[in-house]
Interface confidence: medium
């Protein structure tokens, strides 16, 4: 990456305009405060990529870090990133503004930290003080970063003089947290409410006698304060509770509710947050998908599950072929709807030892006064195949026929095979498949019927053998998605007076 001008530190005039160019062999982009500023990207004819960042009407607030990086830094070395620091000395800007979170520095161990008070002019002398003291602290200062060192749990301010004016920074608060010393828990009666309903939150602290609660919540930001109530749970020693109650919630009350608890003796603090969602009206939403065709195996148990989100709690009904289902006294059907989280539900229909009659069209309907959803599917009962009949006959035509009949759901496939060497078959010799169109010595005719009442297919297949010159083991195998069944018959030539 090539940055023009190269820096790494530039001092620019207030109200001026300045152009920064970054170029590289891949697309490049300028970043400022974790955001890509408006900029223009180009590709030169030599294949070089560039991005031009124009800083117009510069003010002290433009002081800070600028990074040029590859637009897509995946797979690129971390050093493929150029940093440039720009100062715009501006007497109207004292210390650069900090985000609120930068004013609070929390530590869980003794370590070096930086108090990030920065000025727009690298020539200014900056000193660090405890908030309540005039003496400058002997801590090194970096104009680009601030004061770095090991600090005690205190409040600090930075001072500088601009012209004849002494300027103070905001106060920075350093907190060394003993994580175990204070333990806050926050919960809500409901984290989802409809507008007009109440929001009630509780913040509980255990093991402290004197604490201070501070709530932050969406209404507070708009200046509408709600007075929390603090009480002691007398049945438990040192359990102190603060209750925040907002009657008749509005959509704008959605957001993060934070309970900050400080304990003044050791100056410990902890905070917990919870998200509250205020919805215009109730809802029911399906989660995930259930296929429109479901399967169950005959005489096995099958549970059909639907997951959905709802508020307020819904009524759940199941239907089969448009008739309402209920828990059967015989224990053949079990219905249950479980609340797995505040607004998430799992509804289950369990068919115990499934019967053919339980095939059909099922619907689950979840509803309340504001919304409803329904989900439907067809349930197919799968029946393992069985060979019901395997018989051999000698029609007058001189050929010999073997008839195989079987049933199952879904539709069975039929496979005919034969073995000529009875002694070695089927252990040593694999059987030969029959009925292929290329086989001239056998012909195959298969018919399939669907039996509506039994909801299964019947397959009847007839194998015609042109000339059988020695005993032949003929095997009929039926196969479907849930099983297979085989029967075998030995066909002897016409000339032999007996059958094995």
């Amino acid at each position: 990456l090539v940055v023009t001008p190269p820096g790494p530190e530039l001092v620019l005039n207030v109200s001026s305009t300045f152009v920064l160019t970054c170029s590289g062999s891949a697309p490049v982009v300028w970043e400022r405060m974790s955001q890509e500023p408006p900029q223009e990207m180009a590709k030169a004819q030599d294949g070089t990529f560039s991005s031009v960042l124009t800083l117009t009407n510069l003010t002290g607030l433009d002081t800070g870090e600028y990074f040029c990086t590859h637009n897509d830094s995946r797979g690129l070395e971390t050093d493929e990133r150029k940093r440039l620091y720009i100062f715009v000395p501006d007497p109207t800007v004292g210390f650069l503004p900090n985000d609120a979170e930068e004013l609070f520095i929390f530590l869980t161990e003794i370590t070096e930290i930086t108090i990030p008070c920065r000025v727009t002019d690298p020539q200014l002398v900056v000193t660090l003080h405890e908030k309540k003291g005039d003496v400058a602290l002997p801590v090194p200062y970096d104009h680009q970063r601030g004061f770095s060192g090991i600090f005690e749990d205190r409040s600090y301010i930075c001072k500088t003089t601009i012209g004849d004016r002494e300027v103070d920074s905001d106060a920075y608060y350093v907190y060394r947290l003993q994580v175990s010393s204070i333990n806050v828990s926050v919960n809500a009666v409901q984290t989802v409410v409809r507008q007009g309903e109440n929001i009630t939150l509780m913040c509980i602290v255990i093991g402290n006698e004197v604490v201070n609660f501070e709530w932050t919540y969406p209404r507070k930001e708009s200046g509408r304060l709600v007075e929390p109530v603090t009480d002691f749970l007398l049945d438990m020693p040192y359990h102190i509770r603060s209750i925040l109650h907002i009657p008749s919630a509005e959509l704008e009350d959605s957001g993060t509710y934070t309970c900050n608890v400080t304990e003044s003796v050791n100056d410990h603090q902890d905070e917990k947050a919870i998200n509250i969602t205020v919805v215009e009206s109730g809802y029911v939403r399906l989660l995930g998908e259930v296929g429109t065709l479901q399967f169950a195996e005959l005489h096995r148990s099958r549970t059909l599950q639907v997951v959905f989100e709802a508020y307020p709690p819904p009524t759940v009904l199941w239907f089969k072929d448009n008739r309402t289902l209920g828990d059967s006294s015989a224990g053949e059907i079990a219905l249950s709807t479980r609340n797995v989280s505040e607004t998430r539900y799992v509804s289950e229909l369990t068919l115990v030892r499934v019967k053919v009659a339980e095939a059909g069209h099922y619907t689950m309907r979840a509803f309340h006064e504001d919304a409803e959803v329904q989900l439907s599917f067809q349930l197919q009962i799968n029946v393992p195949v069985r060979v019901l009949e395997l018989s051999e006959s000698h029609p007058d035509s001189g050929e010999q026929t073997v008839r195989c009949r079987g049933r199952g759901m879904p539709q069975p496939n039929i496979i005919w095979s034969a073995c000529r060497d009875l002694k070695r078959c089927p252990r040593e010799l694999p059987p030969t498949l029959l009925g292929n169109s290329s086989e001239e010595e056998s012909q195959l005719e298969t018919n399939v019927t669907y039996w509506e009442e039994e909801q299964e297919f019947e397959v009847v297949s007839t194998l015609r053998l042109q000339h059988v010159d020695r005993p032949l083991s003929v095997r009929c195998t039926l196969r479907n998605a849930v099983g297979q069944d085989t029967q075998e018959v030995i066909v002897v030539p016409h000339s032999l007076p007996f059958k094995v």
């Epitope: 955001q35 408006p38 900029q39 223009e40 990207m41 031009v52 124009t54």
Partner: antibody
């Protein structure tokens, strides 16, 4: 009064070339970035190219990159667009537009537009 | 590239009534450092070039009647004509100029009902 007058539009065969010009008056031409924007018949607006004040930096839409070249002659108050390897999809009215940007290069809107010149690419 | 999507594609409003056109960008075009939205609105009448109405999402170009106003921030923007006049019949386009390639919405055709 600001005036931008495009010329050079014509009927050209696919693969052919054309050079558009835009003569500017009523502005300090050398102080502003300039652009070309096109509009296919019955369609919306599509940015084509921008050239910086000093002509040191040029930007192109992907659809024309490598085929079109934008340039300017500040002494003649004129903007150019050299179009090579023309395709049927380049058929459009080409507008010359003045950028609001007064520096070498900066993201900007278009505050003045010419009347446009029609380029037709057809065999 | 930043994709600009306008809605509706076509709009018929009675004279004197309010017309509202929406524009949505596929990514944020508000730059926090200067708190500016890099969005412009243009009006194009049949057979004429586009004319700048609004820039920085809400600043009216000089000479543009005050019945035209722009609002919105981040990714969602609106052009409002408070009381439609016969001469406002045109196609309206939004455009982002946050960075190249500059992109326009597909246009909204405004007619009189």
């Amino acid at each position: 009064e600001v005036q931008l007058l495009e010329s050079g539009g014509d009927l050209v065969q696919p693969g052919g070339s054309l050079r558009l010009s835009c003569a500017a008056s009523g502005i300090t031409f050398s102080s502003f970035a300039m652009s070309w924007v096109r509009q296919a018949p019955g369609k919306g607006l599509e940015w084509v190219s921008t050239v910086s004040v000093s002509a040191g930096i040029t930007y192109y839409a992907d659809s024309v990159k490598g085929r079109f070249t934008i340039s300017r002659d500040n002494s003649k108050n004129t903007l150019y667009l050299q179009m090579n390897s023309l395709r049927a999809e380049d058929t459009a009215i080409y507008y010359c537009a003045k950028s609001s940007c007064t520096t070498n290069s900066c993201p900007a809107y278009f505050d003045y537009w010419g009347l446009g010149t029609l380029v037709t690419v057809s065999s | 590239d930043i994709v600009m999507t306008q809605s509706p594609e076509s709009l018929a409003v009675s004279l004197g009534e309010r017309a509202t056109i929406n524009c949505k960008s596929s990514q944020n075009i508000l730059y926090r450092s200067n708190n500016k939205n890099y969005l412009a609105w243009y009006q194009q009448k049949p057979g004429q070039p586009p004319k700048l109405l609004i820039y920085w999402a809400s600043t009216r170009e000089s000479g543009v009647p005050d019945r035209f106003s722009g609002s919105g921030s981040g990714t969602d923007f609106t052009l409002t004509i408070s009381s439609l006049q016969a001469e406002d019949v045109a196609v309206y386009y939004c455009q982002q100029y946050y960075g190249t390639p500059y992109t326009f919405g597909q246009g909204t055709n405004l007619e009189i009902k």
